[in-house]
């Protein structure tokens, strides 16, 4: 019972986590214009992994994709790669874990096969979560570095009196979504690995011993005794749960240049 619960919960937590990683990757608010200690502008800038957006006081929002691949900072490319790898591993992990769920019976799949699949999906979720956390952390580090660099020369003098205020960027909502989602995927993966231990059939072979009782000839051969998990193999009345969730991150698409200082 505890194993099934652990496995099921691990699956659900990972599912939520991966949905969060997908959402974070698609979100435009990875970095948002820093409003603190800055002149109040009638224009608000925010940037994602795929495009940068400008929201005016008028309510008009204009988003432009980064149509160049080679012109983008290597760090941004690395973050993109980490997030995509995280999503791909997570998706494969979900697929594997669906078949590994103890409450789902597929043909005559052995418990050992289910245990292996559970472990595989668990490891995939752990790596997926680590990829997301790493990606978000790299981006956050990039923001912090750029923030202090732009603070150091925030007011760049141009011909004495005239000043240009550099736009500083701070953490956007996507970073927090990514951290939480990565953490959830990681936790889900750990839970799957824990569940795997309980699913694994521990083969305890005892040598056949003959007991000769007077007047009776009875041979007891306790062999191939399986460690019980508290569940029988009777699946007649078991319900099949097929968990699936989709998140749609709706983004308004408009037809700039990406600015990483």
């Amino acid at each position: 019972m505890a194993v099934t619960a652990c496995q099921g919960l691990g699956f659900v937590v990972s599912l939520i986590g991966i949905a969060g990683i997908i959402a974070a990757t698609c979100m435009d608010q990875w970095s948002t214009q820093d409003l603190y200690n800055n002149p109040v502008t009638a224009v608000f800038n925010y940037q994602g992994l795929w495009r940068s957006c400008v929201r005016e006081s008028s309510g008009f929002t204009e988003c432009r994709g980064y149509f160049t691949l080679l012109g983008l900072p290597a760090m941004l490319q690395a973050v993109r790669a980490l997030m995509i790898v995280g999503i791909v591993l997570g998706a494969i992990g979900l697929l594997v874990s669906i078949f590994a769920l103890k409450c789902i019976r597929i043909g005559s799949m052995e418990d050992s096969a289910k245990a292996n699949m559970t472990l595989t999906s668990g490891i995939m979720f752990i790596v997926s979560g680590l990829c997301a956390i790493a990606g978000v952390s790299v981006f956050a580090n990039m923001l912090v570095t750029n923030f202090w660099m732009s603070t150091a020369n925030m007011y760049t003098g141009m011909g004495g009196m005239v000043q240009t205020v550099q736009t500083r960027y701070t953490f956007g909502a996507a970073l927090f979504v990514g951290w939480v989602a990565g953490g959830l995927t990681l936790i889900g993966g750990v839970m799957m690995c824990i569940a795997c231990r309980g699913l694994a059939p521990e083969e305890t072979n005892y040598k056949a011993v003959s007991y000769h009782a007077s007047g009776h000839s009875v041979a007891y051969k306790p062999g191939g005794f399986k460690a019980s998990t508290g569940f029988g193999s009777n699946t007649k009345n078991k319900k099949i749960y097929d968990g699936g969730a989709r998140t749609e991150d709706e983004v308004q698409s408009y037809p700039s240049k990406h600015d990483y200082v």
Epitope: V40, T41, A42, S57, S58, G59, V162, D259
Partner: antibody, heavy 118, light 113 residues
């Protein structure tokens, strides 16, 4: 077509209050902000502040806090500018203007002359 | 506050001639996010409300004659009337549309010589 129609001229005594209205038509009132601009006789344009009827957000210019209050009524698609404790220097033409994308004032009211005189 | 300085204060130009009005802001009006300059030009005739001519420093509002053009970036901007017509006699204002408060320039009066 888009129209902003302002209330008529006002003659007020110092210390009194005045409420200028700006009725919008031809567009969804809550989708765009309304700005208020003051023009003293023979002077240039002075931005007073703006109100976003969709969010209720208001922003005032530094010299227009306290005695000046911006409000709106969505049911009648009207924005209001209320000035209390009127002074002689408040004598001016007050314009309302719609804030459109590009942060531009694309449509203007005809203006309301407020005269403060004893 | 952002200071918008217009020059000259007044300008007398012959009909059909070019009129050039300058506007300088105390801080850059260029937004790095979309590479747009948030500067707007208005025309005001006596007894009338201002009329929008140019936004984003160089984008002409629909219905505005093509003799009106805007240029410049950052802190220095120009409004040009390529061939002055009698109906162009008015006061022209530039406006910062980037920083609050959305300040206007002092205005430039265009007259016929």
């Amino acid at each position: 077509q888009i129209q902003l129609v302002q209330s008529g001229s006002e003659l007020k005594k110092p210390g009194a209050s005045v409420k200028v209205s700006c009725k919008a038509s031809g567009y969804t009132f809550t989708n765009y902000g309304i700005n208020w601009v003051r023009q003293a006789p023979g002077q240039g344009l002075e931005w007073m502040g703006w109100i976003n009827p969709g969010t209720g957000e208001t922003t005032y210019a530094e010299g227009f806090t306290g005695r000046f209050v911006l409000s709106w009524d969505t049911s009648v698609s009207t924005a209001y500018l209320q000035i209390s404790s009127l002074k002689a220097e408040d004598t001016a033409v007050y314009f309302c203007a719609r804030l459109y994308y590009g942060n531009r004032f694309d449509s203007w009211g005809q203006g309301t002359l407020v005269t403060v005189s004893s | 506050d952002i200071v918008m300085t217009q020059s000259p204060d007044s300008l007398a130009v012959s009909l059909g001639e070019r009129a050039t009005i300058n506007c300088k802001s105390s801080q850059s009006l260029l937004n790095s996010g979309n590479q747009r300059n948030y500067l707007t030009w208005y025309q005001q005739k006596p007894g009338q409300p201002p009329k929008l001519l140019i936004y984003w420093a160089s984008t002409r509002e629909s219905g505005v004659p093509d003799r009106f053009s805007g240029s410049g970036s950052g802190t220095d901007f120009t409004l040009t009337i390529s061939s002055l017509q009698a109906e162009d006699v008015a006061v022209y204002y530039c406006q910062n549309a980037y920083y609050y408060p959305l300040t206007f320039g002092g205005g430039t009066k265009v007259e016929i010589k």
